[in-house]
């Protein structure tokens, strides 16, 4: 071939977003006379993205000095590539023409695709608490990244789940991408420890996935179960109730005693047991002054836990006959656990 | 200093082909284009086309597609221009030329030209 | 193509005067892109100016050009006998590069 050729040696470029990508082109002539002009895309839409005669490119600098005699060297390196400067690139000779240039002939396009990392993989879980046996979704969202591969997993507790439902957009080509994850978890009481993780492994991450992660503590509500017994006498004319509210999440709870359906008194849990699985334990008495009632009281402990509906538990306490021929006052008093942070 | 030899006249007839030359000295003869130009007779001059010897490559005025063809020859620093189907119309001086640049503006040196007379 | 048009074709002038020429493109030509030759009888053509008003090496302070545009010019502000010769205009602003047909200068 005797005349020239415009050569593009790579068809494709992969560039990680931020760096340099250099787009080689080489002339085999300096005829026809006339510039060089580098553009991104084919036809009337193209992006003039260098043009060695004029004007101003300040990411753009040519690989080899263009003014110097002989050079058919013509390759470009662009400075700092973000997503949106993926395309195809064309080296394109011109030829000297009057009153314009006229386009000549292309080189074949180098297409540059850009890496660019996916962002931290944010993690929601529902809005509501569900109890457990009950289906709760976590969502996975992460934005930003090319190529459109990627691979997203579930975790809980270290053991892979299988029910999810993954989406990555757009669906057609794009300068980058959204991957957006849905996965159900089934809740078990002892998920107040648990742990769901988000992992996305892309091929910028060089092996090292980036993970997101959510506690199921935000998303589980454990009931509490409620016992009422009455402990041994102080004193002839006392009796001691306890009742012991156990194994609840979160930690708002409300008690209220009621002595035959009336309100005796109420309190907020404060000082808490924590236990193992990270639920907690919480003890009320009431000690009742049986001088002062001739019949038999019907005690009940009632929890509003966590602002659902209240639970109850009722305890009947025996008047014998010698006590209900004395009256007296009923004192109250609440045992306090050691506490321990939620 | 640049000197550009040219090949001496030449009578050919109608039909024909020629092949003249142009022989440059005084300067890297791979690193400039050559152009080449024709005279007829009491006329202006008319550009042919060019050739770059570097890579032995060539870009022609349209209207002598066909007609003349460029080569060149590194190693003896010669250019030469085939002319072929010769007609009367191809009477003329031919004349090799090198811009003052090497890839153009204008032509500081010419060679003394080569008479081209077809006749039967 | 783009065409250069000299005017006038021929003149002829006596020594000393100052003679003008002009060429005319057809399409606009940068100034860098306009150049002048001379040419003898039975010689190849000789830089005159280059880039519409430079001198090339060794010719006359008394040849100067000017123009811009579509519209150029070749002055000589006093004519010698060794002058005599016709001059072209030559644009390389488009392929394929253009002449303009010659003035002939005759020196009366």
């Known amino acids: 071939e005797d005349e020239l050729q415009v050569i593009q040696p790579e068809k494709s470029v992969s560039v990680a977003a931020g760096e340099s990508a250099t787009l080689r082109c080489a002339m085999t002539s300096l005829i026809p006379v006339g510039p060089i002009m580098w553009f991104r895309g084919a036809g009337a839409g193209r992006e003039l993205i260098y043009n060695q005669k004029e004007g101003h490119f300040p990411r753009v600098t040519t690989v080899s000095e263009l003014t110097k005699r002989n050079n058919l060297d013509f390759s470009i390196s662009i400075s700092n590539i973000t997503p949106a400067d993926a395309g195809t690139y064309y080296c394109v000779k011109f030829r000297k023409g009057s009153p314009d240039d006229v386009e000549f002939k292309s080189g074949a396009g180098t297409e540059l695709s850009v890496r660019a990392k996916p962002s931290a993989p944010v993690v929601s879980g529902p809005a509501v608490r569900a109890t457990p046996e009950h289906t709760v979704s976590f969502t996975c969202e992460s934005h930003g990244f090319s190529p459109r591969d990627i691979t997203l997993k579930w975790f809980k507790n270290g053991n892979e789940l299988s029910d999810f439902q993954t989406n990555v957009d757009p669906a057609g080509d794009s300068v980058s991408y959204s991957i957006h994850s849905t996965a159900r978890v089934v809740l078990t009481r002892g998920d107040v420890h648990s742990q769901v993780i988000c992992e996305i492994a892309h091929i910028t991450l060089q092996g090292d996935p980036l993970r997101g992660t959510a506690n199921l503590s935000e998303a589980i509500r454990v009931p509490p179960t409620l016992e009422v017994t009455q402990q041994p006498m102080r004193a002839e004319n006392q009796a001691n109730v306890t009742c012991q509210v156990s194994n609840f999440y979160p930690r708002g709870l409300q008690l209220t005693w009621l002595e035959n359906g009336n309100v005796s008194r109420t309190e907020t849990a404060s000082t808490l047991i924590e236990n193992k699985d990270g639920t907690y334990n919480w003890m009320s008495w009431l000690l009742v002054n049986t001088c002062a009632h001739r019949d038999d009281v019907v005690l009940t402990c009632q929890v509003e836990h966590d602002g659902q509906q209240a639970v109850s538990k009722s305890y009947a306490l025996e008047i014998s006959a010698h006590q209900k021929e004395h009256g007296s006052d009923i004192t109250h008093e609440a045992a306090l656990a050691p506490t321990a942070p939620l | 200093q640049v000197q550009l030899q040219q090949s001496g006249p030449e009578l050919v007839k109608p039909g024909a082909s020629v092949k003249m030359s142009c022989k440059a000295s005084?300067?890297?003869?791979?690193?400039?284009?050559l152009s080449w130009v024709k005279q007829r007779t009491g006329q202006g001059l008319e550009w042919i086309g060019e050739?770059?010897?570097?890579?032995?490559?060539?870009y022609y005025n349209e209207k002598f597609k066909g007609k003349a063809t460029l080569t060149a020859d590194k190693s003896s620093n010669t250019a030469y221009i085939q002319l072929t189907s010769l007609t009367s119309e191809d009477s003329a001086v031919y004349f090799c030329?090198?811009?003052?640049?090497?890839?153009?503006?204008?032509?500081?040196?010419w060679g003394q030209g080569t008479l081209l007379t077809v006749s039967a | 193509e783009n065409v250069l048009t000299q005017s006038p074709e021929k003149m002829a002038v006596s020594l000393g005067q100052k003679v003008t020429m002009t060429c005319s493109a057809s399409?606009?030509?940068?100034?860098?892109?306009l150049h002048w030759y001379q040419q003898k009888s039975g010689a190849s053509p000789k830089p005159l100016i280059h880039?519409?008003?430079n001198l090339a090496s060794g010719v006359p302070a008394r040849f100067s050009g000017s123009g811009s545009g579509t519209s150029y010019s070749l002055t000589i502000s006093s004519v010698e006998a060794e002058d005599a010769a016709t001059y072209y205009c030559?644009?390389?602003?488009?392929?394929?590069?253009?002449f303009g047909g010659g003035t002939n200068l005759e020196i009366k």
């Open positions: 030329g090198r811009f003052y640049d090497y890839d153009g503006g204008w032509f500081a040196y």
């Open positions: 005084g300067y890297t003869f791979s690193e400039y284009v």
């Open positions: 050739i770059y010897p570097g890579t032995i490559t060539t």
């Open positions: 399409s606009s030509v940068s100034s860098s892109d």
């Open positions: 880039g519409t008003s």
């Open positions: 030559q644009q390389w602003s488009g392929y394929p590069w253009t």
